[in-house]
């Protein structure tokens, strides 16, 4: 029951971190003008990951794409791509952690694979959360950069009476929204590990049986049969008899005295 | 037909408070942010207030915690409440509104309505 | 306070003239987010409201002939008549619309020689 709630809850947690990253990258108030110590504006500034925006005072906003592609800085189209390597991780993780919910029953699929894909989206949501956070985090860390850099240089061409006056950006809201959200698909992907264990079989079947040939004492060990879904490598056998079956990791690789009937 | 009308105005004592309305028609009055300006009598234009569609709210630093700008965008008007007047915000007062797509300039501006501060 | 200043106070021109008055910020109306610049024109006429003339430093609105064109960016702009009419005899108002307090310039009046 708990590894059922544990794995429902971490698909939940890193669904709305998912949803979250999406809106993040799609959001255009990654920096927005910094207003503090600038004279009141009639008109705001603020900048996606693909287009820039106006908004007026007069409540009209304008927004205009980046239409060129090398044109752009390789610190922006690096954190492009880390935040489309975290959506389609944690799309893919989505996929597959429907799949290993303990509550979906799809046809005879056994625990120990239902294990696997769950350890699996675990980690592409791990993965998917740490791609938003350092994207958000490499936006910022350029942001803080060009914030001092432009303070420094804050009026320029102070011919006479004339200031030009340098617009600066802070963090906006879409930087938030992508912390946040990265860091909940990591949680999820976290309490979809931890379920993983809960939902993979302590016990399997034995890895070395001894038959007792009449009138001969040999040892008759087949390879070990391993449920294998592609999911994975660490797989745990399927569990076909209860009685004083042992686990890979108890198997003795001598002869011992469990071996002989 | 776009039509800002003022009204409200009058000769009024230092101190004294006057209430200055704006009634626009012909146009979606909700969907506009709106100013008013006053012309002094050397014929000066100075901007006194904005309200924005969003309620976002600007004066001029004059008139700060003196006048008041509102809307009522269910009766189409803009407001500007004006207490403790002095002798130097006696003008010319226009209603006026933001185009669009005017880059934030003044598209539409009423007949205007006169404000007299004198003992 | 962004400071608006327009020269000449006042022009006197025969019908048929080419005008020109130019009006300077004391701080820089191109937004650098759009590249556009914050800058309009008014004509007042006696006994009448002002009426916006440019918007955005260049465009001219709606109805407005085509002999009134605005000019320049950042700190300088100017306002051009190309062949001055008798009914546009008026005052001339700039006005920073980047900045509040939305300033307007002390204006130019264009008088008849």
């Known amino acids: 029951m708990a590894v059922t709630a544990c794995q429902g809850l971490g698909f939940v947690v890193s669904l709305i971190g998912i949803a979250g990253i999406i809106a993040a990258t799609c959001m255009d108030q990654w920096s927005t003008q910094d207003l503090y110590n600038n004279p009141v504006t009639a008109v705001f500034n603020y900048q996606g990951l693909w287009r820039s925006c106006v908004r007026e005072s007069s409540g009209f906003t304008e927004c205009r794409g980046y239409f060129t592609l090398l044109g752009l800085p390789a610190m922006l189209q690096a954190v492009r791509a880390l935040m489309i390597v975290g959506i389609v991780l944690g799309a893919i993780g989505l996929l597959v952690s429907i799949f290993a919910l303990k509550c979906i029953r799809i046809g005879s699929m056994e625990d120990s694979a239902k294990a696997n894909m769950t350890l699996t989206s675990g980690i592409m949501f791990i993965v998917s959360g740490l791609c938003a956070i350092a994207g958000v985090s490499v936006f910022a860390n350029m942001l803080v950069t060009n914030f001092w850099m432009s303070t420094a240089n804050m009026y320029t061409g102070m011919g006479g009476m004339v200031q030009t006056v340098q617009t600066r950006y802070t963090f906006g809201a879409a930087l938030f929204v992508g912390w946040v959200a990265g860091g909940l698909t990591l949680i999820g992907g976290v309490m979809m590990c931890i379920a993983c264990r809960g939902l993979a079989p302590e016990e399997t079947n034995y890895k070395a049986v001894s038959y007792h040939a009449s009138g001969h004492s040999v040892a008759y060990k087949p390879g070990g049969f391993k449920a294998s879904t592609g999911f994975g490598s660490n797989t745990k056998n399927k569990k076909i008899y209860d009685g004083g079956a042992r686990t890979e990791d108890e198997v003795q690789s001598y002869p011992s005295k469990h071996d002989y009937v | 037909e776009v039509r800002l009308v003022e009204s409200g105005g009058g000769l009024v004592k230092p101190g004294g408070s006057l209430k200055l309305s704006c009634a626009g028609s012909?146009?979606?009055?909700?969907?506009?942010?709106m100013s008013w300006v006053r012309q002094t009598p050397e014929k000066r234009l100075e901007w006194v207030a904005t309200i924005t569609i969003g309620v976002n709210i600007y004066y001029l630093d004059s008139v700060k915690g003196r006048f008041t700008i509102s809307r009522d965008n269910a009766k189409n008007t803009l407001y500007l409440q004006m207490n403790s007047l002095r002798s130097e915000d006696t003008a010319l007062y226009y209603c006026?509104?933001?185009?669009?797509?005017?880059?934030?300039?003044?598209?539409?501006w009423g007949q205007g309505t006169s404000v007299t501060v004198s003992s | 306070d962004i400071v608006m200043t327009q020269s000449p106070t006042s022009l006197s021109v025969s019908a048929g003239e080419k005008v020109t008055m130019t009006c300077k910020s004391s701080q820089s109306l191109l937004n650098s987010g759009n590249q556009k610049n914050y800058l309009a024109w008014y004509q007042e006429k006696p006994g009448q409201p002002p009426k916006l003339l440019i918007y955005?430093?260049?465009t001219r609105e709606s109805g407005v002939p085509d002999r009134f064109t605005g000019s320049g960016s950042g700190t300088d702009f100017t306002l051009t008549i190309s062949s001055v009419q008798a009914e546009d005899l008026a005052v001339y108002y700039c006005q920073n619309n980047h900045f509040y307090p939305l300033t307007f310039g002390a204006g130019t009046k264009l008088e008849l020689k």
């Open positions: 006026t509104r933001l185009g669009q797509t005017q880059r934030n300039a003044m598209d539409y």
């Open positions: 955005g430093a260049s």
């Open positions: 012909g146009f979606t009055f909700s969907s506009y942010t």
